[in-house]
């Protein structure tokens, strides 16, 4: 805490500029008007203040805005953001994606801090949903972000945002997350034609129900075994041999190598031997 002392004659800051780096902490406290600082926040980043000096500037802003900083100040915090605590950030109302990007940029190269996590949380909650632009931004800064969200959090992703999802964004998602994302993807891509639709929906199929797999089997999609192995066991079990053959197309021969693994193993056990024999793969039910 800096003592309240009168500003020495001639030292009152008229603007935020380089001369302030020579001010002692108490001089900054006494001679820099908080309102001036707030209106000229964009200049702070261009000035090589010490951490101690930044502490003083933060203290001045805290006094000016005890209920939390306005977005006009937040957007220009720059490196001062690294001084904020999660408690500070919980007072903010960040609505602009530009503000979010500016602060994530400041933190780039650092680990995701509790401050950044709080900022993202506040931003997403403030928006009420994870819209496409936000998702784009977060996955660009933090690959894997999507799969770090719980199924409950993912439920706030609107179908339109699914267009921002790349296959690699789903690499670490588990089946329960795909259960939530799949219906959104199905809705998002519903107006695409067969082959284009399959390319887009493929990464989400770990959440697909039986009826959708049956429908896909009628569209000559040639699903690869890696995708088939990620399907829900309960969704695969009711499929007939003919449907699986159509679903996999030329990849059906790969069933032999996977016959002891789920979901293939459990599916084989559900089929009539006569039907399995039609595949000519030597599968034993």
């Amino acid at each position: 805490e800096v003592e309240k002392t009168a500003c020495p004659s001639g030292k009152k800051a008229r603007e935020i500029d380089e001369s302030l780096i020579f001010y002692k902490k108490w001089e900054l406290e006494a001679c820099v008007d908080a309102a001036l600082l707030a209106t000229q926040m964009d200049r702070v980043n261009a000035i090589p203040f010490t951490y101690e000096q930044l502490d003083v500037l933060k203290h001045k802003l805290d006094e000016l805005y005890p209920q939390g900083y306005p977005e006009s100040v937040i957007q220009h915090l720059g490196y001062l953001f690294l001084k904020m605590s999660p408690e500070d950030i919980r007072k903010w109302n960040v609505t602009s994606l530009e503000t979010l990007k500016a602060l994530l940029e400041v933190n780039k190269g650092h680990e995701m801090s509790p401050q950044v996590a709080t900022l993202i949380d506040r931003f997403v909650k403030g928006r009420g949903q994870l819209d496409k632009d936000t998702l784009d931004t977060l996955t660009a800064f933090y690959p894997g972000y999507l799969c770090s969200l719980s199924p409950e959090e993912l439920s706030s992703v609107p179908p339109s945002s699914i267009w921002a999802v790349r296959p690699q964004d789903l690499d670490t998602c588990d089946p329960r997350q795909l259960d939530v994302l799949y219906p959104k993807a199905r809705l998002a891509f519903q107006n695409m034609n067969g082959s284009e639709y399959f390319v887009k929906i493929q990464s989400f199929l770990g959440g697909a129900p039986t009826e959708d797999l049956k429908a896909l089997s009628q569209q000559n999609v040639s699903m690869d075994l890696a995708t088939f192995m990620k399907l829900r066991t309960d969704a695969v079990l009711p499929l007939t041999v003919a449907e699986v053959q159509k679903l996999l197309g030329p990849h059906v021969e790969g069933l032999k190598a996977e016959e002891r693994h789920r979901p293939v193993r459990d599916w084989i056990l559900r089929q009539r031997q006569d039907d399995l024999d039609t595949l000519g793969l030597g599968l034993q039910g």
Partner: nanobody, 121 residues
């Protein structure tokens, strides 16, 4: 370097209980999702349960109501309480952590070495 150490596996009669632990180390704060997977002999690794960064949990259908996942953030440890165990639960159980926004060596996800659970009828 991120490391995961599982413990708590063992042999138990059907209907019995076990509590698995997975202690994570080698990273500071970031968004983390902890998951348990299992792999029976000759089978692929399958998802069992997860605890997400917001503290909510999820389970595969076959273990719902029998298994409970929880975590101790102070110790960076996740637990899997397994009750009413059945022979079908016999497998090697693996802990996995996914880190987002961490500067750590190697790439997420990270896997533990596994702990064996054997349930006899």
């Amino acid at each position: 370097e991120v490391q995961l150490a599982e413990s708590g596996g063992g042999s138990v009669q059907a209907g019995g209980s076990l509590r698995l632990s997975c202690a994570a180390s080698g990273y500071s704060y970031c968004r983390s999702t902890m998951r348990w997977y299992r792999q029976a002999p000759g089978n692929v690794r399958e998802f069992v349960s997860a605890i997400y960064s917001d503290g909510t949990t999820s389970y595969t259908d076959s273990v719902k109501g029998r298994f409970t996942i929880s975590q101790d953030n102070a110790k960076n440890t996740v637990y899997l309480q397994m009750n009413s165990l059945q022979p079908e639960d016999t497998a090697m159980y693996y802990c996995r952590i996914d880190l987002v926004g961490c500067n750590v060596a190697g790439g997420s996800p990270y896997w533990g070495q596994g702990t064996q659970v054997t349930v006899s009828s």
